[in-house]
């Protein structure tokens, strides 16, 4: 870890506080050991150099120790997610020490001032950890810093300044403004802990990105591409409010990272898996559902430690609420065309039928365009566990659902008015489950009838385990 930029005094001088707060003799950073799940309980305030509170409050030197670090705030009161996270940690790790890092006086500022305060808060945490290290049995290996938004970068500074290396830092949608593209010593980065895992839920390539877009950890997970989170759209958020603003959407998407992490703690039996991929578009095409060579991982608390030479970007889809887990499928469809299709893009839907349940009708998202006489790959996901897949219904939507499609159809007709009808042939569909890594092949129910046209459907039944590839070995990954 690089050394701190200056002596402690210099760091204290950096504090950006209103005049009224500067005269305070009380510390601007407080460490509250949450000794009980009861929110009414005052907990214990830890004070550097004072061992008595540690003993009085039953600080467990050999147990895991979590430091929860909030971010910038527009309020003098903790946001509600904090209680949920503390409670979830207590539920999952009963013997653990859960410490809330309260830096509200320094975070409840102009954003730029709060950013400038992150370094000194990180330094305060590092000093607390250095002091705890002097105690018998306390190990930095057992320390897990969890930082939300600006708090993620505070965790980075803490990991940077501490003597030694903390076990883990989880960045929950680390803040973007003033950190995007910054030097590694001025933001959360992989060398701040033995394992740095990051969830990105509010990244935008246009306008202001509240969350950082660049990968900053050993693994960087981008649920739903890291941008638009289900259940956070204007309609979802404003539709249920008497008064609503875009702020609610921002809060919903930015804070989703916290709720995904909470979900990983409380719904251990429903873990969500993310898959390594170079970019969001390739993931949306269904290309990246491999678990070979550590290419998939659980998200949140259950993430397995991976220290790659370079950042690993991982993607997954989620539900709109807890439990967030979905089941991912890669679908490979070889499309034959015996007739000139023109420019029209088919709108395909699939329904999956399994031993446990049947899916809803799912759209096949066409990321670029359907390649004719070629194999097209799609990503579909279901909210329920279907069990073993038995059959698939493929539908080509008839009536146009958008002006854009209508225009394309009209243009296609004008260019080929005598085209007797649009028709595609599909003989089989190959499916791979992301969660089980199982591969299956589905063949057209009627081998004599493999053609599909608008308003029509085709049925496919499972015809073999695995894919029609010679000598292919497909190790099934046992995931919990």
């Amino acid at each position: 870890s690089p050394t701190p930029f200056g002596p402690e005094g210099q760091l204290e001088d950096e504090l950006h506080k209103p005049k009224a707060i500067q005269t305070e003799v009380k510390p601007s950073v407080r460490f509250n050991l949450r000794t009980s799940k009861d929110p009414e309980h005052e907990g214990c305030y830890l004070s550097l150099g004072h061992s008595q509170p540690l003993e009085d409050c039953g600080f467990n030197m050999t147990a895991k120790t979590f430091f929860i670090i909030h971010g910038w705030t527009m309020s003098g009161i903790f946001e509600n997610w904090l209680h949920k996270l503390v409670s979830a940690l207590h539920t999952r790790e009963k013997d653990a020490n859960v410490v809330v890092v309260d830096w509200l006086p320094l975070a409840h500022q102009l954003y730029t001032d709060a950013v400038n305060n992150t370094r000194v808060v990180g330094h305060s945490i590092a000093r607390m950890l250095d002091w705890l290290q002097e105690k018998d049995d306390f190990s930095l290996e057992n320390v897990h810093l969890i930082g939300y938004s600006l708090g993620a970068h505070v965790a980075g500074y803490a990991g940077n300044f501490v003597k030694g290396t903390v076990g883990r830092i989880t960045g929950l949608d680390p803040a973007g403004p003033m950190f995007e593209g910054a030097d590694i010593h001025k933001r959360l980065s992989p060398d701040d802990a033995d394992f740095v895992d990051v969830l990105h839920t509010y990244t935008r390539s246009f306008g202001l990105s509240i969350g950082i877009q660049m990968p900053v950890g050993h693994i960087d997970i981008y649920p739903n591409g890291g941008d638009f989170q289900p259940g956070c759209g204007l309609n979802d958020v404003l539709g249920s409010m008497a008064y609503g603003t875009i702020t609610e959407v921002v809060k919903c998407e930015h804070e989703r990272a916290v709720h995904l992490f909470v979900d990983s703690l409380v719904n251990q039996d429903k873990p969500s898996f993310a898959f390594q991929c170079t970019d969001s578009n390739r993931f949306k095409k269904g290309i990246c559902l491999s678990c070979r060579k550590n290419r998939c991982n659980s998200i949140g608390y259950n993430a397995k430690k991976m220290r790659n030479k370079r950042n690993s970007k991982m993607y997954l889809k989620t539900r709109a609420g807890m439990p967030f887990r979905v089941y991912h499928y890669q679908m490979k469809i070889h499309v034959f065309s015996y007739k000139n299709m023109g420019e029209i893009e088919p709108t395909f839907y699939v329904t999956l039928y399994g031993t446990n349940a049947d899916s809803q009708t799912l759209p096949l998202e066409i990321v670029e365009r359907i390649e004719q006489n070629a194999t097209n790959t799609f990503l579909v996901y279901t909210e329920e566990d279907l069990g073993d897949l038995l059959k698939i219904q493929l539908t080509w939507e008839g009536a146009s659902q958008s002006w854009y499609n209508l225009w394309k159809e009209l243009r296609s007709y004008l260019s080929q008015p005598h085209n007797p009808g649009r028709e595609l042939n599909i003989r089989r569909i190959r499916v791979k489950s992301g969660e089980t890594q199982r591969k299956l092949t589905f063949c057209a129910e009627d081998p004599e009838n493999t053609s599909i046209s608008p308003g029509r459907e085709l049925w496919f039944r499972k015809c073999r385990d695995g894919w029609r590839m010679k000598n292919e070995t497909s190790p099934t990954v046992e995931l919990p």
């Epitope: 929110p39 309980h41 305030y45 309020s75 003098g76 009161i77 903790f78 509600n80 209680h83």
Partner: antibody
């Protein structure tokens, strides 16, 4: 024993201002947020806002942003709410309530201060 | 703002009966819901916090359940001292809001 003692009833004319007090005892005043709630006659409760006594940080219900100002005096463990430009709509019982550590639920309430605005 | 709806304005019960009071949120509020009892000319009193957590000093006949948007306060064998107004409150997002209340009265 935790206690929140509020100031007495007020009868004021429209346009006036009033400062209601809430003196806390039985706990560390700076460790918990203090909230203010309005209850109009025979009606439900409305959250006005909350203050963090540790450093004076506040959060307001947008509806009361121009009406109420929350402050604290740490030396006397007292929270204050000032209401300005009073109208008959402000006639109500006002409660202070101690938040839990996260500020979410209110286990202790003051006895209420009745404010009557009448010309 | 999150709207909390207590569909029953008044509930008439006989002492000894068991009763359930409902509170519905206009959006998912997880478990961030609290229940209060208020008797005439008194301050509200916290009965249940965070949907189901009991409060010391509150009789065990009061219990809470629910998560997301639908919540219930149950009173097992109502006693005469239980009559009064019951309010729910959410702390999921600002501004914190209260339900319109349900009046529990003697039949």
């Amino acid at each position: 024993e935790v206690q929140l003692q509020q100031s007495g009833p007020e009868l004021l004319k429209p346009g006036a201002s009033v400062k209601i007090s809430c003196k806390a005892s039985g706990y560390t005043f700076t460790d918990y947020t203090m909230h203010w709630v309005k209850q109009s006659h025979g009606k439900s409760l409305e959250w006005i806002g909350g203050i963090n006594p540790y450093y004076g940080g506040t959060t307001y219900n947008e509806k009361f942003k121009d009406k109420a100002t929350l402050t604290v005096d740490k030396s006397s463990s007292t929270a204050y709410m000032e209401l300005r430009s009073l109208t008959s709509e402000d006639s109500a019982v006002y409660y202070c309530a101690k938040g839990d550590y996260y500020g979410g639920s209110y286990n202790y309430w003051g006895q209420g201060t009745t404010l009557t605005v009448s010309s | 703002d999150i709207v909390l709806t207590q569909s029953l304005a008044t509930l008439s019960v006989t002492p000894g009966d068991s009763v359930s009071l409902s509170c519905r949120a206009s959006q998912d509020i997880s478990n961030s819901l609290h229940w209060y009892q208020q008797k005439s000319h008194e301050s509200p009193r916290l009965l249940i916090k965070y949907a189901s957590q009991s409060i010391s000093g509150i009789p065990s006949r009061f219990s809470g359940s629910g998560s997301g948007t639908d919540f219930t306060l149950s009173i097992n064998s109502v006693e005469t001292e239980d009559f009064g107004m019951y309010f729910c409150q959410q702390s999921n997002s600002w501004p914190y809001t209260f339900g319109g209340g349900t009046k529990l009265e003697i039949k």
